[in-house]
Interface confidence: medium
């Protein structure tokens, strides 16, 4: 029969404008190995890992997205445009495939928020 | 075996769009990537964009507003479009396929010319 | 955007020589290389991958070297066919390839 095996995420994550967050996800298994791993935004491909190959970051992320820790990704220069749904997918032998789906929340920065609340209760002081 | 052959117009005006074909066999188009490459008259090679297996697209940063690229895997054809071409567009043009992120099969190459 | 740095981008060489090519990356890209050789009207080929894995098919007189930032191509006893251009190529961060090498014969 397959190999059991699971996958651990933080399922909801928040990180700053302009900041920088790790995606991370933790699979677990007692005998499957992990062969290779995809991170998609979506379905836009971020980057794999291959065992046998090393790293390789999708062009369009290749200045904001760094491999590790692990078999995690930091994307760094974080946009607003960066919230939306990014999927792990392992490939493991002889366990098949996993997938975890994280949801990455990215908020104005402090700085501007508190930027934007002073701008707005000037004119009333 | 593993074959790929590009095809598209010898010369295009300048401003106007360039339309190429990547004809591949061999291998399908829902399990491996193809890319085109480009290689200007006596100069290096570029990479332009390529077209994953699942079907999403990774673009050259400095042509992406120009570029598109797409597929009909039941043909196996991939298809390069890239408007508002530029005497400095005058390259040969390459598909080449890759397993991972070096391009292990490639094809023979079309010669374009961006002229009036 | 990674840069690649080929040297020496013109090489003359005589037939059985063992000659060295040469590849710098701008920042680390660990082993993510490749080795192409280009002949004009002939599909480019892949030479070396993961910076010293031969491809199937390649004679073995090619060997790759390297990591990190430094790399090297290396044709133990050249023959009259390796007369060709040769590029570099990194896939750590996107791809980029080196501006080449001519090898040509004394």
């Known amino acids: 029969g397959a190999t059991a095996g699971t996958i651990d995420t933080k399922r909801n994550i928040s990180a700053e404008e302009g900041g920088s967050v790790i995606l991370q996800c933790h699979f677990s298994s007692d005998t499957a190995e992990v062969t290779q791993v995809d991170w998609k935004q979506q379905d836009q491909l971020l980057a794999i890992y291959s065992v046998d190959l090393g790293w390789h970051v999708a062009s369009v992320f290749s200045d904001r997205v760094v491999p590790g820790p692990s078999l995690g990704l930091t994307f760094q220069s974080l946009t607003m445009n960066d919230t939306g749904e990014y999927f792990c997918t392992y490939h493991t032998y002889p366990g098949g495939i996993y997938k975890g789906r994280i949801f990455l929340k990215v908020q104005e920065s402090s700085d501007d928020r508190n930027g934007l609340a002073q701008f707005q209760t000037a004119p009333l002081g | 075996q593993v074959q790929l052959m590009e095809s598209g117009p010898g010369l295009v005006q300048p401003s106007q769009t360039l339309s190429l074909t990547c004809t591949v066999s061999?291998?399908?188009?829902?399990?491996?990537?193809v890319h085109w490459v480009r290689q200007p008259p006596g100069k290096g090679l570029e990479w332009i964009g390529a077209?994953?297996?699942?079907?999403?697209?990774d673009y050259n940063s400095a042509l992406k507003s120009r570029l598109n690229i797409n597929r009909d895997s039941s043909k196996s054809q991939v298809f390069l479009k890239m408007n508002s071409l530029q005497t400095e567009d005058t390259a040969i043009y390459f598909c080449t396929k890759s397993g991972w992120a070096f391009f292990d099969y490639w094809g023979q190459g079309v010669m374009v010319t961006v002229s009036s | 955007d990674i840069q690649m740095t080929q040297s020496p981008s013109l090489l003359s060489a005589s037939v059985g020589d063992r000659v060295t090519l040469n590849c710098i990356a701008s920042q680390n890209i660990y082993k993510s290389l490749a080795w192409y050789q280009l002949k004009l009207g002939e599909a480019p080929k892949l030479l070396i991958y993961?910076?010293?894995s031969l491809q199937a098919g390649i004679p073995s007189r090619f060997s790759g070297s390297g990591s990190g930032t430094d790399f090297a191509l290396t044709i133990s006893g050249l023959q009259p066919e390796d007369v060709a251009t040769y590029f570099c190529?990194?896939?750590?961060?996107?791809?980029?390839f080196g501006a080449g090498t001519k090898l040509e014969l004394k």
């Open positions: 190529q990194q896939y750590s961060g996107g791809y980029t």
């Open positions: 061999g291998f399908p188009l829902t399990s491996y990537t």
């Open positions: 077209i994953w297996s699942s079907g999403s697209t």
């Open positions: 993961n910076a010293n």
